[in-house]
Interface confidence: medium
């Protein structure tokens, strides 16, 4: 056999050994078929290979595992459980692999797993115990620090007869396993609302991305417990106004940066408090870019340039004078 190509530290199919005699020492770690492996970088890439299951012969040294662009469909319990365990696996990327079901305990026996990316999978069925591994009221803490769940909403016709937001939140909160989570990305999921208890139970969050959803209001969402929060992405939602309670909570977070671009702000009398706050606060990034969407007469006006005289509400007519 020929020597491995020296062009890169990744190898995948070039022979590893110059000869093939019986006296060779055994190779404890093979590279799975259809994957590329770099022991030096502790990385395995099985990318865009139409794999229908997780390879069973993953090398024990793997620290970074990319299984993107495949056709995995289902992640069963113990999908990564091995004997001996994959004790060093710290970063697992499963994005774009056509997963529609992640079962309870799918990520069990990964004691070092810190980063998990399930983005761009149509998760019609995400088990409440996908991340906690058990249905105990208090589970063993998950080692996860980053959980990336961007664009995991399935097509309309594949959703179960239940709230998608509720399904995701149930998985995030089960067994209080994700108390150590620092980054949570939930962008592009058509979320209409954020269940009120979700943030209170993720006290370690530093970064929360809820951009490109359909959030209309944050009225019932409390940020009070998120004392470590550094970035909150709310761009490209359907927010009309932020009310006093929310403004005060955000202002009270010591390290926060909030991103509010591309929301359809309604510049009427209810916007007065938010405009006042925007003029004073340092927490909103790009606040000079925020513009009104409604009413029509206010469209494209910059929020920071408004004054109280601009922010009026049409008087509510008594029923006798209302027209259909």
């Amino acid at each position: 056999s020929s020597p491995t190509s020296s062009a890169s530290s990744f190898s995948s199919s070039a022979p590893f050994l110059a000869s093939a005699v019986s006296a060779q020492p055994p190779l404890p770690d093979q590279c799975p078929a259809l994957c590329e492996c770099s022991e030096a970088a502790r990385t395995v890439k099985c990318v865009n290979r139409n794999l229908t299951e997780v390879p069973t012969d993953l090398p024990a040294y793997v620290r970074n595992l990319f299984l993107t662009g495949n056709q995995l469909a289902v992640l069963p319990a113990g999908a990564f459980a091995r004997r001996p365990p994959l004790a060093e696996l710290a970063a697992l990327n499963l994005s774009g692999s056509r997963l529609d079901e992640v079962r309870a305990g799918a990520f069990e026996h990964l004691p070092s797993l810190r980063q998990l990316d399930l983005s761009h999978n149509p998760l019609a069925d995400l088990s409440p115990f996908a991340f906690s591994g058990s249905n105990a009221s208090v589970s063993a803490p998950s080692p996860l620090v980053e959980l990336i769940l961007n664009h995991i909403v399935p097509p309309e016709d594949e959703r179960q007869n239940r709230s998608f937001e509720g399904m995701v939140v149930a998985a995030l909160l089960a067994g209080r396993a994700l108390q150590g989570l620092r980054r949570l990305e939930l962008a592009s999921n058509h979320f209409l609302y954020l269940p009120r208890d979700v943030l209170a139970q993720l006290p370690s969050l530093r970064h929360l991305d809820l951009s490109n959803n359909s959030l209309v209001s944050l009225t019932y969402v409390s940020f009070r417990n998120l004392t470590h929060l550094e970035s909150l992405h709310l761009e490209d939602n359907a927010l009309k106004v932020l009310h006093n309670g929310t403004l005060a909570e955000l202002q009270g977070l010591p390290h926060i940066r909030v991103f509010l671009d591309n929301n359809p702000w309604v510049c009427d009398c209810h916007m007065a408090d938010m405009v006042t706050w925007l003029k004073e606060t340092e927490v909103v990034q790009g606040k000079d870019r925020l513009t009104c969407a409604y009413p029509e007469k206010m469209r494209n006006r910059v929020l920071l340039e408004l004054n109280s005289a601009d922010l009026d509400c049409d008087p509510i007519l008594p029923p006798s004078l209302q027209t259909s």
């Epitope: 056999s1 995948s12 199919s13 093939a20 055994p26 078929a33 259809l34 590329e36 012969d57």
Partner: antibody, heavy 120, light 111 residues
């Protein structure tokens, strides 16, 4: 010297079974993934099945899935192909071939082949 | 499945002259690091023999008159100076995904 020697071929009726063997020598068999590839008379090569070094992963061509089973016995340095529900279109020379150690590139060593004829 | 299309079907070459065989995959069989394309020679009555792996790497023991090139979907096997012993059928094969598939083969004859 690396050697792969297939055996077990023969003439068999449609619907019956046959088990092919591939005896390996001259290298550490347990370190290598192994494949079966077949060649129908006068035709090109068709990949049939793959098994990883420790028998933890198997892959099959759609044409044989559910009928053929690949296995290996590392203590005997032998690769097997159990062929059930044989059809006329399974008639071919069957080669075993080795994947290079550690990474999967081309198939670097091949046996001489064993002939399977499915005929009534 | 990835379809491998080889051209020409057959090739008649004068000894000492070059020869070239093309193989086109129905989708890319290259990553940013490697091309998962290999070339085999099969002489009459013999099993195939690996000539080139990963598009351009010469297998040990193979004469250096053989060379391979290409990436993505288009690959080429070249013989710089054909010799009488080079007669046989040449196959390309990818190992990008399951199933591995082979080209239909190119028969090389000597004029």
């Amino acid at each position: 010297e690396v050697q792969l020697v297939e055996s077990g071929g023969g003439v068999v009726q449609p619907g019956r079974s046959l088990r092919l063997s591939c005896a390996a020598s001259g290298f550490t068999f347990s370190n290598f993934g192994m494949h079966w590839v077949r060649q129908a008379p006068g035709k090109g090569l068709e990949w049939v099945a793959y098994i990883s070094s420790g028998s933890s992963t198997f892959y099959y061509a759609d044409s044989v899935k559910g009928r053929f089973t690949i296995s290996r016995d590392n203590s005997k340095n032998t690769l097997y192909l159990q062929m059930n529900s044989l059809r006329a279109e399974d008639t071919a020379v069957y080669f075993c071939a080795r994947s290079p150690a550690y990474y999967r590139y081309g198939l670097d060593y091949w046996g001489q082949g064993t002939t399977v004829t499915v005929s009534s | 499945d990835i379809v491998m299309t080889q051209t020409p079907l057959s090739l008649s070459v004068t000894p000492g002259q070059p020869a070239s065989i093309s193989c086109r995959a129905s989708q890319s069989v290259s990553s940013s690091t490697f091309s998962y394309m290999h070339w085999y020679q099969q002489k009459p009555g013999q099993p195939p023999q690996l000539l080139i792996y990963s598009s351009s790497n010469l297998e040990s023991g193979v004469p250096d008159r053989f060379s391979g090139s290409g990436s993505g979907t288009d690959f080429t096997l070249k013989i710089s100076r054909v010799e009488a012993e080079d007669v046989g059928v040449y196959y390309c094969q990818h190992s990008w995904e399951i199933p591995y598939t082979f080209g239909g083969g190119t028969k090389v004859e000597i004029k």
